[in-house]
């Protein structure tokens, strides 16, 4: 348990043996739009009730049609895959060493909640203290994408800006996708207000996922540094 | 293991409608239509969720066709309105074990039913 008395969950869904990944033999992109750069970045979906399993499915297909357009590799694109609710389960985690398409299946497999809380504060607390507690590749952009679609209650938000401030003082970028009519704006405003790189983008509901994710997944990307040149042997 | 039958197709005038019913043998969670066109591929048409009722339907067929499901029964339904001979095609229904795969990719599911055919003549 962290000290602020956060559970920490188990780090893995039930995934088939581990095959060995050998990172130089990638798999081929999928798409015209391919991110190559160094990345860390963390999907965190919001799995209270106030979307329905339909909806959460959409969810999910937008985060493995993302994971399509990142070169997904311990060197360049990696990923970490958070379900969110009263507490915080991590699907894949940043250290994961499987093939791009056996991270995104573990994405498809994300579990529906239903809860009737996803504690935005709780989540980016689990952001602070386990996926960002030590930066092991200060070289690399981090990016938390926030996929939120309810209000947390205000018993759970008196941490939230502490929260925001202690990730933007790591150097993670916040990024909040308000989904429907009861994403809590508030809080997006809170997020965007900390750091000019926490721009937000609020739909008013799953489907319109889809229309936005080039723009999303762009936006990611120019934020990430491009991998230096090979050095060249004097 | 989950047995799958559908029933309810036929020949049918563009602009009519049917209505597809697939039995399910045993408990299901998620329960879909997909069906496949003469010399296509399968495509996802609509789905339903057990736990909330929950659907989601393909954008060609949104607004005309809509899937429901009697929980006591064990049975999903395809309503099928304004028909249009572009709707032809082998009508299947489908269920998984796990979620493995998109709601809308074939390798999702794991069980499949023998495939009901549907024709609209203009």
């Known amino acids: 348990q962290e000290p602020g008395g956060l559970v920490v969950p188990p780090t893995d869904a039930p995934v088939s043996p581990t095959t060995l990944y050998v990172e130089d033999i990638s798999e081929p992109p999928l798409h015209d739009f391919y991110c190559s750069r160094l990345l860390d970045l963390v999907f965190l979906l919001d799995g209270s009730s106030r979307l329905s399993e339909a909806e959460f499915e959409v969810l999910k297909a937008f985060v493995v049609d993302m994971m399509e357009r990142l070169r997904i590799s311990q060197k360049w694109v990696r990923v970490a895959v958070v379900e969110y609710h009263d507490g915080s389960h991590a699907y894949i985690g940043l250290k994961d060493r499987k093939r791009p398409s056996e991270l995104r299946r573990i994405a498809s497999q994300v579990k529906y909640a239903g809860s009737q809380v996803a504690s935005t504060s709780e989540v980016l607390k689990y952001t602070l203290f386990q996926i960002f507690s030590k930066i092991d590749r200060p070289e690399a952009s981090r990016i938390a994408l926030l996929l939120m679609a309810s209000q947390e209650p205000q018993r759970m938000s008196r941490n939230f800006v502490r929260y925001v401030q202690g990730l933007k003082k790591k150097k993670v970028i916040v990024i909040p996708v308000g989904i429907g009519p009861h994403a809590n704006l508030k809080q997006i405003r809170l997020i965007e207000k900390q750091a000019p790189e926490n721009k937000a983008f609020v739909l008013s509901s799953v489907d319109e996922l889809e229309q936005q994710r080039d723009e999303i997944v762009s936006y990611l990307c120019d934020l990430a540094p491009e991998a230096p040149p090979p050095t060249l042997p004097p | 293991q989950v047995q799958l039958v559908e029933s309810g197709g036929g020949l049918v005038q563009a602009g009519g409608s049917l209505r597809l019913s697939c039995a399910a043998s045993?408990?299901?969670?998620?329960m879909a239509w997909f069906r496949q066109p003469p010399g296509k591929e399968r495509e996802f048409v609509a789905v339903?969720?057990?736990?909330?009722?929950?659907?989601l339907v393909a954008a060609s067929v949104k607004g005309r066709f809509t899937i429901s499901r009697d929980n006591a029964k064990n049975t999903v339904y395809l309503q099928m309105t304004s028909l249009k001979p572009a709707d032809t095609a082998v009508y299947y229904c489908?269920?998984?074990?796990?979620?493995?795969?998109?709601?809308?990719?074939?390798?999702?599911?794991?069980?499949w039913g023998q495939g009901t055919q549907v024709t609209v003549s203009s």
């Open positions: 489908a269920t998984s074990r796990g979620y493995s795969g998109t709601y809308y990719s074939t390798s999702r599911y794991d069980y």
């Open positions: 045993g408990r299901t969670k998620d």
């Open positions: 339903i969720y057990s736990s909330d009722g929950s659907t």
